[in-house]
């Protein structure tokens, strides 16, 4: 039949950061194409990435409709080319993905320190509230909008002249920490969702140090 030399997709893997979600799979196609379908446990199977020779499919638009739902995808392999014989093909081959719950599993993207401001012996460090592709009322929500108090940030800070790190935590996007007068400090932040069992932490933000352009120093 026409499906004699089609190969089922394998190694179906979800790659997701801040809800930007792509399904990847193997192999690179030879004389075949793929169509992806996605569904919630109770919903319809919706076809996406029709008849593609890519081995990835951006499913962000589907999963952002409800990030707390659990999704399943499947990749169909369709013959396309000079197969060994032509004739009416049976059901196409397909492979299921693992289940994926965006709210619980999307990776937290690397955060960015937006600014820091020193007033005397206090420093206010602000973390950029990154925009996601999740929408509500036609506007894109920030990471904080989506996760609320489930999301915390950990601040690592240290004197430029030493290696001993201190930490602080916040469930907003701002830290207010005590520093020694006359000392320069360096900062790095990490996003954390403590309630998660997987993908709990982001990578650390780039390090920002006092005395560089991002910050503002005011002696009071």
């Amino acid at each position: 039949s026409g499906t004699t030399n089609t190969v089922a997709a394998y190694n179906l893997t979800w790659k997701s950061t801040n809800f930007k979600t792509i399904l990847e799979w193997e192999p690179k196609p030879v004389n075949q194409v793929y169509t992806v379908q996605i569904s919630t446990k109770s919903g319809d199977w919706k076809s996406k990435c029709f008849y593609t020779t890519d081995t990835e499919c951006d499913l962000t638009d589907e999963i952002v409709k409800d990030v707390k739902q659990t999704y399943l995808a499947r990749v169909f392999s369709y013959p396309a080319g000079n197969v060994e014989s032509t004739g009416s093909a049976g059901e196409p081959l397909y492979e299921n993905s693992p289940e994926f719950t965006p709210y619980l599993e999307t990776n937290l993207g690397q955060p960015t320190i937006q600014s820091f401001e020193q007033v005397g012996t206090k420093v206010n460090v602000t973390v950029e509230d990154e925009r996601t592709l999740v929408r509500r009322n036609n506007t894109f929500l920030s990471l904080r909008d989506v996760f609320g108090k489930d999301l915390i940030y950990t601040l690592y800070y240290w004197k430029s002249s030493s290696s001993g790190k201190k930490t602080a935590k916040t469930n907003t996007n701002e830290f207010l920490i005590d520093v020694d007068k006359g000392e320069n400090y360096c900062f790095s932040v990490q996003a954390v969702i403590p309630s998660r069992t997987v993908n709990r932490k982001s990578t650390d933000s780039p390090v920002e140090c006092m005395g560089q352009e991002k910050g503002e120093f005011r002696e009071i």
Partner: antibody
Framework: EVQLVQSGAEVKKPGESLKISCKGS????????MNWVKQMPGKGLEWMGM????????RLNQKFKDKATLSVDKSISTAYLQWSSLKASDTAMYYC??????????WGQGTTVTVSS | DIQLTQSPSSLSASVGDRVTITCSAS?????MNWYQQKPGKSPKIWIY???NLASGVPSRFSGSGSGTDFTLTISSLQPEDFATYYC?????????FGGGTKVEIK
């Protein structure tokens, strides 16, 4: 048995509005994309676009972006193609066709639209 | 948009003849279908995925090609094969059809 039944022939004047329909039966209507194809008299086929009934997502041929609108009514398993202001160049046969892989191939019988003053 | 150019636009042939219809794409295509349409009827899928015959299509039909050049061949033309044939690409949006090839009786 899968069936797509389209509404009857229409004769309209330029500038008038029109909505033609395609009713699906014998399958889960919301699970399949629905295509619309235009065929002008004595001419070839033109893919206009398609709509996914479950959430009304559309993929539209940019050529028809400002000319025609696709919609659905899930409650009665019906897809629609509509115009707000018809032109003579809209005179054609319009087919709906379920998006399927392979030998599965379901088309409506077509709706003839004639636009003439 | 990918343009599909079919040739010839029409041909006259006799029963038993070998007939070849070509479809040339303006850029590379990985998924090509062919449809048959008879006067006053809706189109029917004839060949899908470049070379796979739809259910009920006789084995005298075949499809081949890759990249930008595709072919539908009828090895021995039969009376019921007189119709118009269209290629269609589904590799990139908007999906497009060729202009059609009308196969007429000589």
């Amino acid at each position: 048995e899968v069936q797509l039944v389209q509404s009857g022939a229409e004769v309209k004047k330029p500038g008038e509005s029109l909505k033609i329909s395609c009713k699906g039966s014998g399958y889960s209507f919301t699970s399949y994309w629905m295509n619309w194809v235009k065929q002008m008299p004595g001419k070839g086929l033109e893919w206009m676009g398609m709509i996914y009934p479950a959430d009304s997502e559309t993929r539209l041929n940019q050529k028809f972006k400002d000319k025609a609108t696709l919609s659905v009514d899930k409650s009665i398993s019906t897809a629609y193609l509509q115009w707000s202001s018809l032109k003579a160049s809209d005179t054609a046969m319009y087919y709906c066709a379920r998006e399927d892989y392979g030998s599965s191939d379901y088309w409506g019988q077509g709706t003839t639209v004639t636009v003439s003053s | 948009d990918i343009q599909l150019t079919q040739s010839p636009s029409s041909l006259s042939a006799s029963v038993g003849d070998r007939v070849t219809i070509t479809c040339s794409a303006s850029s590379s295509v990985s998924y090509m279908n062919w449809y048959q349409q008879k006067p006053g009827k809706s189109p029917k899928i004839w060949i899908y995925g470049i070379s796979n015959l739809a259910s009920g299509v006789p084995s005298r039909f075949s499809g081949s090609g890759s990249g930008t050049d595709f072919t539908l061949t009828i090895s021995s033309l039969q009376p019921e094969d007189f119709a118009t044939y269209y290629c269609q690409q589904k590799s990139s949006f908007p999906w497009t059809f060729g202009g059609g090839t009308k196969v007429e009786i000589k």
